[in-house]
């Protein structure tokens, strides 16, 4: 993923004030999928599109804020634009795009959260657990976990015990851990959202 | 994918303004953005500004303001930069960018 | 508006040897870009989104980081790598460059 971003960006950018303004009103009441917040209403009509596309990115990650935005693009009659979005979104930068996939996520199970639908797979198969650390330290892990987490000796471990600190976390602190997981191994959570 | 093709080679007095094209290809225009970026020899990249071409939304670094003015053209597909009030210090290669993709760039020599 | 600074300006190489260039900004950005750049031809897009790399990339470069800190790191330099590589932010309007690191093969 990762161009996700980028394109969610300029398409909100490439909206006349009032596109984006009516673009934002939708969002409020735009059905969401389950487990998933809604961005307070006082701060989004506050922002501009920069913030927005930030804002969406952190509230629902690359992959569904993509989806979402390209829903709402669809619902105001821009579908050329909504397209433009999800090809952008489902191809690598220079590839030919792959044509649209299934919605990730769609076969998951409701309110359950990505990290614990693939919690075997990725005790399997994470090998850049320190990294993960870094990116979660001082946010979702205090000091003595992750301490306790670096000194497991193997990545398996490391991850098992990183795991059991999640029962503790919200969605939030989950969607951390997903977004470092999308940026360390892009590839790993493709694969997974596409089992 | 997207193609750039930029105007060629540019001269122009001190004083003078010029207007650079950038003409985009493969892809809807008003999808995405346009970058222009400047360049002097041996030196680095300068981020000029965006346009976003279905809104003309326009974003410039400050110290551009007042120098640069970035237009589209839906109807061609081409974006423009117009460079005011020349000098030599705006001689150099202006590139325009998609998010992935960059044109060949313009040399511009203001020159007496 | 967000400074970067990259570090080293230049630096040579030998082949084989792991080479790493840092991009330092100014205030926090959520993602960091690179570009490639050799004498007389356009930037190209390199890594975006801090990690992830771009179209025809080798495999033996890779891009890691957050908040104010990110780097670029080839595992085992080899000639072709020889050139300029720029870092740009997108997180804040002016999208600032970083001012370049110039690698070199020895």
């Known amino acids: 993923m990762g161009r996700a971003r980028d394109a969610i960006l300029d398409a909100l950018e490439n909206l006349t004030a009032e596109e984006l303004k009516k673009f934002k009103l939708k969002l409020l009441s735009v059905p969401l999928r389950e487990g998933y917040g809604r961005i307070p209403r006082g701060a989004l009509l506050s922002m501009d599109a920069l913030d927005l596309t930030d804002k969406l990115v952190s509230f629902y990650l690359e992959t569904y804020g993509a989806e979402l935005t390209a829903n709402v693009l669809r619902d105001m009659g821009l579908q050329e634009m909504a397209g433009q979005l999800q090809a952008a979104t489902h191809q690598g930068s220079g590839a030919a795009p792959a044509g649209i996939q299934a919605p990730p996520q769609s076969a998951a199970k409701p309110g359950l959260h990505f990290i614990d639908q693939h919690r075997a797979a990725l005790i399997a198969r994470v090998t850049n657990v320190e990294w993960l650390l870094d990116a979660l330290y001082g946010k979702v892990l205090t000091d003595e976990q992750y301490q306790a987490v670096r000194a497991e000796p193997t990545n398996p471990s490391k991850m098992r015990k990183l795991f059991s600190f999640t029962p503790a976390w919200n969605w939030t602190c989950k969607d951390l851990l997903l977004q470092a997981l999308r940026e360390s191994q892009s590839y790993l959570v493709e694969d997974l959202e596409r089992s | 994918q997207v193609q750039l093709q930029q105007s060629g080679v540019e001269l122009a007095r001190p004083g003078a303004s010029v207007k650079l094209s950038c003409k985009a290809s493969?892809?809807?225009?008003?999808?995405?953005?346009i970058t222009w970026v400047k360049q002097r020899t041996g030196q680095g990249l300068e981020w000029i500004g965006v346009?976003?071409?279905?809104?003309?939304?326009?974003y410039y670094d400050e110290k551009f303001k007042g120098k640069a003015t970035l237009t589209a053209d839906k109807s061609s597909s081409t974006a423009y930069i117009e460079l005011r009030s020349l000098t030599s210090e705006d001689s150099a290669v202006y590139f325009c960018?998609?998010?992935?993709?960059w044109g060949q760039g313009t040399t511009l020599t203001v020159s007496s | 508006q967000i400074v970067l600074t990259q570090s080293p300006a230049i630096m040579s190489a030998s082949p084989g040897e792991k080479v790493t260039i840092t991009c330092s900004a100014s205030?926090?950005?959520?993602?960091m870009y690179w570009f490639q750049q050799k004498p007389g031809t356009s930037p190209k897009f390199w890594i975006y989104?801090?990690?992830n790399l771009a179209s025809g990339v080798p495999a033996r470069f890779s891009g890691s980081g957050s908040g104010t800190s990110y780097s670029l790191t080839i595992s085992r330099m080899e000639a072709e790598d020889a050139a300029t590589y720029y870092c740009?932010?997108?997180?804040?309007?002016?999208?600032?460059f970083g001012s370049g690191t110039k690698l070199e093969i020895k």
């Open positions: 960018a998609t998010r992935d993709y």
């Open positions: 493969g892809s809807t225009f008003t999808s995405y953005s």
């Open positions: 346009i976003y071409p279905r809104s003309d939304n326009t």
């Open positions: 205030s926090s950005v959520s993602y």
């Open positions: 989104s801090t990690s």
């Open positions: 740009q932010q997108r997180s804040n309007y002016p999208f600032t």
